[in-house]
C-alpha cells in the first residue's frame, strides 16, 4: 500500500518534470549530478540524488513563479517506505557526487527516465507473462 502510494507520487512527478522541460532555457545552466543506468536496488538512492540537486530558476522572464513552484514539488519528500529505508542503508550505492554531472535538460531527462523505470518495475511486479524482453 505504501509502495503503491509512492509510485503514484512518482507518476505525478513525471508530469512535473515534463513541465519543467518546457522551461529549460529559464533554468540556471549549472551542471548537476544526474544518475543514469542506475543499478538494481539503488533506485531510491539515485532518486534522492535528483531531489537534492540544486535545480534553480534563472529569475528571468515571466516563468519564475511556475518554475519555482514546480521545483518545490519535485523536492517534496515522499512518505517513507521500507524499500526506501532499506536502500538508503546500502553502502554499495554510488554517492551523489560520483554521478556524471549534466546541464538541466539532460538532468531532467535522466530524472524522468529513473521515475519511469521505477513505475515500470512496480507495474511488472504485479503482472505475470506480459514482459517480453
Amino acid at each position: 500500500q505504501g509502495q503503491d502510494r509512492h509510485m503514484i507520487r512518482m507518476r505525478q512527478l513525471i508530469d512535473i518534470v515534463d513541465q519543467l522541460k518546457n522551461y529549460v532555457n529559464d533554468l540556471v545552466p549549472e551542471f548537476l549530478p544526474a544518475p543514469e543506468d542506475v543499478e538494481t536496488n539503488c533506485e531510491w538512492s539515485a532518486f534522492s540524488c535528483f531531489q537534492k540537486a540544486q535545480l534553480k530558476s534563472a529569475n528571468t522572464g515571466n516563468n519564475e513563479r511556475i518554475i519555482n513552484v514546480s521545483i518545490k514539488k519535485l523536492k517534496r519528500k515522499p512518505p517513507s517506505t521500507n524499500a526506501g529505508r532499506r536502500q538508503k542503508h546500502r553502502l554499495t550505492c554510488p554517492s551523489c557526487d560520483s554521478y556524471e554531472k549534466k546541464p538541466p535538460k539532460e538532468f531532467l531527462e535522466r530524472f524522468k527516465s529513473l521515475l519511469q523505470k521505477m513505475i515500470h518495475q512496480h507495474l511488472s511486479s504485479r503482472t505475470h507473462g506480459s514482459e517480453d524482453s
Epitope: 503503491d4 513525471i14 519511469q116 513505475i119 515500470h120 507495474l123 503482472t127 506480459s130 524482453s133
Partner: antibody, heavy 117, light 107 residues
Framework: QVQLQESGPGLVKPSETLSLTCTVS????????WGWIRQPPGKGLEWIGY???????NYNPSLKRRVTISVDTSRNQFSLKLSSVTAADTAVYYC???????????WGQGTLVTVSS | DIQMTQSPSSVSASVGDRVTITCRAS??????LAWYQHKPGKAPKLLIY???SLQSGVPSRFSGSGSGTDFTLTISSLQPEDFATYYC?????????FGGGTKVEIK
C-alpha cells in the same frame, strides 16, 4: 507538442501480416514508452502492447504470439507487426505515447485496417 | 485480466449540466486509473491520470475521484466541446484494459 501519425496499408488479406508505422514529431522517441491500441468497429479500446525507448516490450497476452513492436530511433518511428490476421483484427489502430508508463498522454488519429480477401 | 465496466453507456445532457460517469474495476487497482476523451476521427485525449490528477492543459471543469474499485469522472459544467465518448483505463497491471466507453450526447 508531440504529434503521432500512423501509416500503412488499409487493407490486408487473411493469414497475412499487418504492418503499421507510427512517426513521431515534436519530440524525441529516445525516451518514454510507445504503444499501440486498437478499436474494432462498434467495440471498445484494446491495448496491444508497447515498447520502451530502450527496446523492452510488453504485449497483451491475448495477442502476444502474433505481435512484434519495434522502434527505430534514427527515424523517430516505431512499428507494429501482427501476423496471421483474420477478420477479427479489423479495427482502427492507434499509436500513442506513454510518458507515465501506464497511461497514454499523446495519441495518433488512428488508421482503419480492414482484413478481407 | 482486470475488467473495467463503465456506466452509463450513454448520457444525454445540455450545455451547463453537471455530468458524472462511473467506472468500476473487477479488482482493486488503488488509484491507477486514467480517463480519456475521444471524438470521432480525432486522437483520444488524456484528461486524468492516477484517478484524480488533471493532465496538463485540461480544463479544471474535469475532475476525477475514487480509489480501489470505484471511480468517477465529473464534468462540472458541460461545454459544447465536451460532447464526446469518455473511456476509463486501468493502469494497475498488464494487460492494460479500458472500459467500454460512455457517450455524452446533446439533449
Amino acid at each position: 507538442q508531440v504529434q503521432l501519425q500512423e501509416s500503412g496499408p488499409g487493407l490486408v488479406k487473411p493469414s497475412e501480416t499487418l504492418s503499421l508505422t507510427c512517426t513521431v514529431s515534436g519530440g524525441s522517441i529516445s525516451s518514454d514508452f510507445w504503444g499501440w491500441i486498437r478499436q474494432p468497429p462498434g467495440k471498445g479500446l484494446e491495448w496491444i502492447g508497447y515498447i520502451s525507448s530502450r527496446g523492452s516490450t510488453n504485449y497483451n497476452p491475448s495477442l502476444k504470439r502474433r505481435v512484434t513492436i519495434s522502434v527505430d530511433t534514427s527515424r523517430n518511428q516505431f512499428s507494429l507487426k501482427l501476423s496471421s490476421v483474420t477478420a477479427a483484427d479489423t479495427a482502427v489502430y492507434y499509436c500513442a505515447r506513454s510518458a507515465g508508463v501506464a497511461d497514454f498522454d499523446f495519441w495518433g488519429q488512428g488508421t482503419l485496417v480492414t482484413v478481407s480477401s | 485480466d482486470i475488467q473495467m465496466t463503465q456506466s452509463p453507456s450513454s448520457v444525454s445532457a445540455s450545455v451547463g449540466d453537471r455530468v458524472t460517469i462511473t467506472c468500476r474495476a473487477s479488482q482493486g487497482i488503488s488509484s491507477w486509473l486514467a480517463w480519456y476523451q475521444h471524438k470521432p476521427g480525432k486522437a483520444p485525449k488524456l484528461l486524468i491520470y492516477v484517478a484524480s490528477s488533471l493532465q496538463s492543459g485540461v480544463p479544471s471543469r474535469f475532475s476525477g475521484s475514487g480509489s480501489g474499485t470505484d471511480f468517477t469522472l465529473t464534468i462540472s459544467s458541460l461545454q459544447p466541446e465536451d460532447f464526446a465518448t469518455y473511456y476509463c483505463q486501468q493502469a494497475n497491471s498488464f494487460p492494460l484494459t479500458f472500459g467500454g466507453g460512455t457517450k455524452v450526447e446533446i439533449k
